[in-house]
């Protein structure tokens, strides 16, 4: 069977159909619509927004959408018991405190229910004590301070700049060296462009703008009280003090007016380099405590925030398959936003929107897809991935055996200069090819394709002629489908040049003043990169749903199994001695993926050349492709990562926003040098180097000829 | 169009206590320090205080600390200074300003460049 059996519409055509529907205008409109009010996670107002997409998508033409809720720990400023931060005097005066709320933006005066920023799940406390400016808190800065400088964190309160790594590693990574509590701030070096205005005149941070943010360790275990598990009526929840992630020490954000305050007054050593110093008129002195004349003067927290097990809401929305139903291409974004949500989340669910519609409209023309394709408006994505993750644990059985890929729809821009693809190596042909075939929206380009302005905006650092497409990290939504469940995932949005920008993510980013009028004035007036983010996104989708055989490429992943095995080999071998000692070798490694490669070159010829009329064939095939990435699953996960299971890619250790190659090995081999048993050390590395390389050939062998 | 209306003063004798009042308008009053400033007949300005744009903060100059308070209504849009203690050189024409920089506040350092002033209130301190 066709999969247009349900239309007369040509494939070509479809495909043409579902693109041209989606409009730049529309996607203004649903945005302008999804940012007029706050819709944070677990509250009335996102509820409504819930209900309203659920209205909106069954008006669309989907078969049928439905609400999941869920019970999840979710974290909340106390109304009347603000969070601040004081310097303190010898008496316990209290001369300075950081504000209580961020300068509303114009014509945002009167919005209630805008929450003040906080640090999510940060515990309740009143620390206080002398400060140590830790950089951006990543591990590094942590060894030069320790090692290097021999300043010990124990007992102080440390003062991070956001930006590198994700703040939950931060924060992490101060609990370990002893802090008692964390002030994150943002500084201008990371969040104030050279020449751009602060907003509401351009899309600069200003001065008491301040960046909210989750400060969760999960390593993916979704709701922190009910890992593994669903978060439904019947839940057996767990102690607060067992709860996954949590942090144990109060973290506070600030903006740079606020941390101006506190850094200028900072003595101690003075920073180890330039890479220490931002762009404050501050020494950035490491401390710890306040120079000679305010050496008396300390530094208070006051924390008092909650954390409440509360309802959130996921909107799934089905589209069902005409000839196989039961394999499902997912598109999901989040839908809660810390206030306004002007990029974060909703530039990604107002395409998402008119994605919807345009299927909507399709099949309202008589036209299915061939597969079922299933579209979710997450909640609770701000506090730790929540929604999604739960709805994947409640519904793991099917996903396993019916998942044939999951499309991320988060923000559509950080950006304006080029399009940024993160994706399984399964899907770089795919990306490639329809690149292809869209306009690229870029100035200059016109009547070029988008993968030439991506390509020579975003060239591969490998191949020539071909663009930059990078590894899966996690902190989105993607990571429950990818990580946990195995199953082949992307996201594509549009970036920043990061060449010429080096501040982190985009400035006003979960700030108050991200807001409609940012993107509308400032990022994507004419809503020309929303849509080509909604032809890439909604193109991938289509593909996936639609394509007779599944638009993956195993040779792509052998391809990048012979550079990930190169690299982490190589960084081995800066302990050659080591080596030699403890007898490790990484032949059984290297001969899995040369075995990898071989099976799927020879895989490749078979789909090129077998009967696709034949539909048991067909499936076949397909189900080899579909379960591919399933079989880089270790069903025991990660070593003390029992939710990061996929052997291939995980999260940084050190920074969960990015991806680390056989992440088993590299987290044996890091620092190894300072273990305190090398032998015991250096054992580890052999078994990972061991279950990496039984992976790698246990996944080729599913490529193998069935019989 | 940015608009402070300050109103209050008058005549007092030395020891007692005067609230001037400043109604602000055409801006997000909850997005700006405000500061009382005042100008002695003869001299130049002098800053008195300034709250931040939150309220959670609050600087004196020497000479009005621990008798003057300044606070602001957000649901009035209106900035106040509490005189108690008057003295005869407390006597000047007061006025309040506008920070010029959203959510800056901290001190009196540069209240000399505040952009917006109002017509000031004529406090008089005698016996």
């Known amino acids: 069977k066709s999969s247009n059996e349900a239309t007369n519409i040509t494939p070509k055509h479809n495909m043409k159909a579902f693109l041209d529907e989606l409009k730049a205008e529309n996607i203004k409109k649903f945005l302008y619509n999804f940012t007029q009010i706050p819709h944070l996670a677990g509250t009335e107002q996102n509820f409504q927004l819930a209900k309203q997409i659920q209205s909106q998508w069954k008006e669309f033409g989907l078969d049928s959408v439905e609400l999941a809720h869920y019970d999840v720990l979710l974290s909340y400023p106390n109304k009347t018991h603000p969070n601040y931060i004081s310097i303190i005097n010898e008496d316990g005066n209290e001369i300075f405190n950081t504000s209580l709320f961020e300068p509303p933006p114009p014509g945002y005066e009167n919005v209630s229910d805008i929450v003040p920023p906080f640090s999510a799940f940060s515990p309740q406390g009143m620390p206080e004590g002398d400060l140590v400016y830790v950089n951006y808190a990543r591990t590094e800065d942590f060894f030069k301070l320790e090692r290097d400088m021999k300043i010990n964190c124990s007992g102080k309160i440390v003062i991070a700049r956001y930006g590198k790594v994700f703040r939950g590693n931060k924060v992490k990574n101060a609990q370990l060296a002893g802090a008692k509590g964390v002030i994150l701030y943002s500084d201008p070096a990371d969040y104030f462009a050279p020449g751009v205005k602060s907003y509401p005149d351009g899309w600069n941070l200003p001065g008491g703008g301040v960046q909210r943010g989750n400060i969760l360790n999960l390593n993916g275990a979704g709701d922190p009280l009910t890992p593994g598990y669903p978060a439904n009526e019947y839940a057996y929840r767990r102690g607060i003090a067992e709860a996954v992630g949590l942090p144990s020490i109060p973290v506070h954000p600030i903006g740079y007016y606020d941390a101006q305050k506190l850094l200028e007054k900072m003595g101690g050593s003075a920073p180890p380099d330039s890479s220490w110093r931002g762009s404050l008129k501050v020494p950035y002195n490491v401390g710890p405590g306040f120079t000679g004349n305010f050496s008396t003067q300390k530094v208070k927290m006051h924390i008092h925030s909650t954390n409440e097990v509360t309802r959130i809401y996921n909107v799934i929305g089905t589209l069902r398959g005409a000839v196989e139903p039961d394999r499902y291409v997912i598109l999901g974004g989040h839908r809660d936003s810390w206030v306004f949500g002007g990029i974060d989340p909703q530039s990604g669910a107002a395409v998402v929107h008119e994605i919807v519609r345009s299927f909507g409209t399709l099949k309202k023309e008589g036209w299915r897809p061939r597969r079922t394709i299933l579209f979710a408006s997450w909640d609770a994505e701000e506090f730790g991935l929540l929604g999604s993750t739960e709805w994947a644990e409640e519904n793991s059985r099917l996903l396993q055996e019916r998942g044939v890929a999951y499309i991320n729809a988060d923000s559509s821009i950080e950006g304006n200069y080029t399009l940024r693809v993160d994706c399984t190596p399964l899907m770089y042909s795919l990306v490639h090819n329809l690149t292809k075939e869209l306009k690229s929206p870029d100035e200059g380009f016109e009547g070029k394709s988008l993968y030439e302005s991506w390509t020579k905006k975003s060239p591969s650092p490998e191949f020539s002629g071909m663009p930059r497409i990078s590894k899966l990290g996690s902190g989105n939504d993607f990571e429950v489908f990818f990580q946990r469940l195995g199953i082949a995932s992307g996201r594509a949005r549009y970036t920043k040049n990061w060449e010429t920008n080096k501040f982190s993510g985009y400035p006003l980013y979960h700030s108050v003043y991200e807001t409609y009028e940012l993107v509308e004035k400032f990022y994507d007036p004419m809503f020309k990169y929303h849509l080509t983010v909604a032809q890439v996104r909604g193109g991938m989708v289509f593909e996936l749903a639609n394509s007779i055989v599944l638009p993956f490429d195993c040779r792509d992943y052998a391809v990048v199994l012979r550079k990930y095995a190169d690299k982490i080999y190589s960084i081995s071998m800066k302990h050659p001695q080591e080596m030699k000692t403890y007898s490790v070798s990484f032949d059984s490694l290297f001969s899995a993926v040369k075995n990898f490669t071989e099976i799927a070159s020879k895989f490749s010829e078979r789909l090129q050349d077998f009967d696709k009329s034949n539909p048991i064939v067909l499936r076949m095939m397909n189900d080899q492709l579909m379960f591919l990435e399933r079989a880089f699953i270790d069903p025991l996960g990660l070593p003390d990562r029992p939710f990061y299971r996929h052997v291939i890619y995980a999260p940084s250790s050190h920074n969960k926003y990015a991806g680390e190659s056989f992440p088993g090995i590299y987290d044996a081999l890091f620092d190894i040098e300072s273990k305190v048993d090398p032998s015991k050390a250096w054992g580890e590395v052999k078994r990972q180097i061991y279950v990496a390389a039984f992976t790698v050939q246990a996944a080729a062998e599913t490529l193998s000829e069935v019989a | 169009q940015v608009q402070l209306v300050e109103s209050g003063g008058g005549v007092v004798q030395p020891g007692r206590s005067l609230r001037l009042s400043c109604a602000a308008s055409?801006?997000?009053?909850?997005?700006?320090?405000m500061h009382w400033v005042r100008q002695a007949p003869g001299k130049g300005l002098e800053w008195v205080a300034v709250?931040?744009?939150?309220?959670?903060?609050?600087y004196y100059a020497d000479s009005v600390k621990g008798r003057f308070t300044i606070s602001r209504d957000y649901s009035k849009n209106t900035l106040y200074l509490q005189m108690n203690s008057l003295r005869a050189e407390d006597t000047a024409v007061y006025y309040c300003?506008?920070?010029?920089?959203?959510?800056?506040?901290?001190?009196?350092?540069?209240?000399?460049?505040?952009?917006?002033r109002g017509q000031g209130t004529l406090v008089t301190v005698s016996s």
């Open positions: 709250i931040s744009y939150d309220g959670s903060n609050k």
């Open positions: 300003a506008r920070e010029p920089r959203i959510g800056y506040y901290y001190d009196s350092s540069g209240y000399d460049s505040l952009d917006y």
């Open positions: 055409g801006f997000s009053f909850r997005s700006y320090g």
